[in-house]
């Protein structure tokens, strides 16, 4: 179950309810735990996790990545710009999280939990954002054809793609977590 106002919170009235920032922080950490579990299965199943950074860098995927201009790093930090980047990035990751849904045998539920928790996280962050107009939503048609293309790859490429998505999503969330703690 994704984190939120769980039964422990309800049963202890003296405990302060989570602030918006705390809820977001908790949500990201929950998703990161899920990614760790999925990475464990991927690494046990194939030797993709030993792949060199060079090989992984030479990919055709356009996975969201934090850059200096996004204002999420300590130098040149910009709360507004950064929040837009985090939300936009998470929206772009959604198609890749959909791709992951049929990629796990023993961690099927975990993959679904990561996907659903990310949707909840996006909603939390959209409530926090002031400039929602600056957030571009990916085109559904483009996403549908991308998904078809990813699913058509040979098994080796699908294993590599799965590994790279998990690694990139983990890095993106870790950067987001650091940035959000400064807001």
């Amino acid at each position: 179950v994704p984190p939120g106002e769980d039964s422990k919170d309800v049963a202890a009235p003296h405990r302060q309810p989570l602030t918006s920032s705390e809820r977001i922080d908790k949500q990201i950490r929950y998703i990161l735990d899920g990614i760790s579990a999925l990475r464990k299965e991927t690494c046990n199943k194939s030797n993709m996790c030993e792949s060199s950074k060079e090989a992984l860098a030479e990919n055709n995927l356009n996975l969201p990545k934090m850059a200096e201009k996004d204002g999420c790093f300590q130098s040149g930090f910009n709360e507004e710009t950064c929040l837009v980047k985090i939300i936009t990035g998470l929206l772009e990751f959604e198609v890749y999280l959909e791709y992951l849904q049929n990629r796990f045998e023993s961690s099927e539920e975990q993959a679904r939990a990561v996907q659903m928790s990310t949707k909840v996280l996006i909603q939390f962050l959209q409530k926090k954002a002031k400039n929602l107009d600056a957030i571009t939503t990916p085109d559904p048609t483009t996403n549908a054809s991308l998904l078809t293309k990813l699913q058509a790859q040979n098994q080796w490429l699908q294993d590599m793609t799965t590994h790279l998505i998990l690694r990139s999503f983990k890095e993106f969330l870790q950067s987001s977590l650091r940035a959000l703690r400064q807001m």
Epitope: E58, N59, Q155, L157, M160
Partner: antibody, heavy 118, light 111 residues
Framework: QVQLQQPGAELVKPGASVKLSCKAS????????MHWVKQRPGQGLEWIGE????????NYNERFKSKATLTVDKSSSTAYIQLSSLTSDDSAVYYC???????????WGQGTTLTVSS | DIVLTQSPASLAVSLGQRATISCRAS??????????VNWFQQKPGQPPKLLIY???NQGSGVPARFSGSGSGTDFSLNIHPMEEDDTAMYFC?????????FGGGTKLEIK
Amino acid sequence: QVQLQQPGAELVKPGASVKLSCKASGYIFTSYWMHWVKQRPGQGLEWIGEINPSNGRTNYNERFKSKATLTVDKSSSTAYIQLSSLTSDDSAVYYCSRSDTKATCDYWGQGTTLTVSS
Amino acid sequence: DIVLTQSPASLAVSLGQRATISCRASESVGNFGISFVNWFQQKPGQPPKLLIYAASNQGSGVPARFSGSGSGTDFSLNIHPMEEDDTAMYFCQQSKEVPYTFGGGTKLEIK
């Protein structure tokens, strides 16, 4: 050594169905995908589909989705292709071939010549 | 589907000379630093035989006179020096994504 054994020929009447076999030996059957390829006389090669013997997962060429069904019998290390509603266009040599996860077909059967004729 | 265009359709080469067959893909067949192009040789009445995989790697037991090169969308198979036994049909194939597709084939003969 790796071997993929296929019957040499099959003669079938139009409208009928046929199930062609490919018996694998000399390697762990469930560790490699099995592919099926069609070749009409004097023509090129056409990929029909592949099956993962470990879990039965299949991928088909859209052109053959309503024509071919791929299955495996793990106990006898045999792959099958069932072809339905046969017409003269289905007369061809059908090859089975094993591949690694990169879909590189390194070993091939000798092929089964299917003749559809009344 | 990825379309592979092979050229020439037929080729006659003198013994000891070089034979070059080209294969062009309708889109990139590479990812993660690997080009998913394979080359096969087929003689009459026989199944195809793997010569080259992943664009430039020799199949097991394949003579050194067969070599492959290329990346992205353009690939080639080189045979040098040409021998009598090399008379056959040659096919390129992409194994990047389903449906895995083959080129139309090149008929190689001795001049």
